[in-house]
Interface confidence: medium
């Protein structure tokens, strides 16, 4: 069905990091262009990137609105100069997006470590609470002001000398291990919502060593 | 156990001063929005100003009806946040409460017992 | 600053009615709207954010509506344990209070 100078978009894909969230089609438009809309399950609908020759269109500041609502795309295709001509049901052709919730879905970044301090036998690990796109009242909210206790980190820590790895756990920003006196440690962490199905962790943050820039020392 | 105690409330004149405290326990208070909210006597709820967390540079916003008046700060080696009231009316007699603040849906998600600032001449 | 005028400031209903409280914003807030319910001696509680979000745990007799600058609360079968005073918050720009709704059992 519809026109025969369109074709409709397939392989709508969302792709999404720390709630910057694109929505991703296919093919590349030859004489159409395209429009998209995004809903929520009981919402209206609100069109986005109008009449693009684009394959993907940024929702970001709509699925910040409530990351906790389940959102629903779709891509309207129209003869390139002529959008008003429509498909043979009288409408645009179009195709629907898979359902998208962003708190349950979006991928967690890649984490740095901010800083680590050494006093004796033990160092205090901070990770850098990253920011997202979610904002509110003037500011964009941290990593921890949208998941809360649902997040954790996850820290990797190994002597410098050997590869063999210790993890410790933490529902803050902060961990404090033990480690020996006049040995050097490297370190990665790993952010993780233990409670999703899928996208749970996010990939290993650069490791960080002692004896580097990175690090505070005070041996007491 | 999330806990916040509010102390530092009583009777002031006009024009007067008084700082109230609120000290925090059982969560990492650095992680935190922390804000302040009131209650007159036989009236509503009034937000007064919130601190912002660590991530955010704990910035600070207020009312209206107290911006200049009014200052929030906390000192995290204590885990303690403050509201220093200065120039004080009769129509800011009210229960001082303070609360954590979820900055994302705006939750208020722990609340202090609250002190009553009485201000009279 | 923005606005919020909550009406009615009390009402009385029966158990099992459906009640509605209103609330309308100065300027246009999007749907950044919550509904708290506080009762006597404890801190109020979040039952509705962005207005129509149910907080986890919340029976589903609660709802909310509207958006822009007006917008509605509704218990759609009221039981003994709600009564308590009910405000809505705006969080669109800073924080602001309605001046809450007073409900009772008949």
């Known amino acids: 069905s519809g026109t025969t100078n369109t074709v409709a978009a397939y392989n709508l894909t969302w792709k999404s990091t720390n709630f910057k969230t694109i929505l991703e089609w296919e093919p590349k438009p030859v004489n159409q262009v395209y429009t998209v809309q995004i809903s929520t399950k009981s919402g209206d609908w609100k069109s986005k990137c109008f009449y693009t020759t684009d394959t993907e269109c940024d929702l970001t500041d709509e699925i910040v609105k409530d990351v906790k609502q389940t959102y629903l795309a779709r891509v309207f295709s129209y003869p390139a100069g002529n959008v008003e001509s429509t498909g043979s049901a009288g409408e645009p052709l179009y195709e629907n997006s898979p359902e998208f919730t962003p708190y349950l879905e979006t991928n967690l970044g890649q984490p740095t470590i901010q800083s680590f301090e050494q006093v004796g036998t033990k160092v205090n690990v901070t990770v850098e609470d990253e920011r997202t796109l979610v904002r509110r009242n003037n500011t964009f909210l941290s990593l921890r002001d949208v998941f809360g206790k649902d997040l954790i980190y996850t820290l990797y820590y190994w002597k410098s000398s050997s590869s063999g790895k210790k993890t410790a756990k933490t529902n803050t920003n902060e961990f404090l291990i033990d480690v020996d006196k006049g040995e050097n440690y490297c370190f990665s962490v790993q952010a993780v919502i233990p409670s999703r199905t899928v996208n749970r962790k996010s990939t290993d943050s650069p490791v960080e060593c002692m004896g580097q820039e990175k690090g505070e020392f005070r041996e007491i | 156990e999330v806990q916040l105690v509010e102390s530092g409330g009583g009777l002031v004149q006009p024009g007067g001063s008084l700082r109230l405290s609120c000290a925090a326990s059982?969560?990492?208070?650095?992680?935190?929005?922390m804000s302040w909210v009131r209650q007159a006597p036989g009236k509503g709820l009034e937000w007064v100003g919130f601190i912002r967390n660590r991530a955010q540079g704990y910035t600070t916003e207020y009312a209206a009806s107290v911006k200049g008046r009014f200052t929030i700060s906390r000192d995290n080696s204590k885990n303690s946040l403050y509201l220093q009231m200065n120039t004080l009316r009769t129509e800011d007699t009210a229960v001082y409460y303070c609360a954590r603040l979820t900055m994302v849906v705006a939750e208020f998600d722990y609340w202090g017992q609250g002190t009553l600032v009485t201000v009279s001449s | 600053a923005i606005q919020m005028t909550q009406s009615p400031s009390s009402l009385s209903a029966s158990v099992g009615e459906r009640v509605t409280i209103t609330c309308r914003a100065s300027?246009?807030?999007?749907?950044?709207l919550n509904w708290y319910q506080h009762k006597p001696g404890k801190g109020p509680k979040l039952l509705i954010y962005y207005t129509s979000t149910l907080q986890t745990g919340v029976p589903s007799r609660f709802s909310g509506s509207g958006s822009g600058t007006d917008f509605t609360f509704t218990v759609s079968n009221l039981q003994p344990e709600d009564i308590a005073t009910y405000y809505c918050?705006?969080?669109?720009?800073?924080?602001?209070f309605g001046q809450g709704t007073k409900l009772e059992i008949k």
């Open positions: 059982g969560f990492t208070f650095t992680e935190y929005h």
């Open positions: 918050l705006q969080y669109d720009n800073l924080l602001t």
């Open positions: 300027q246009d807030i999007n749907k950044y």
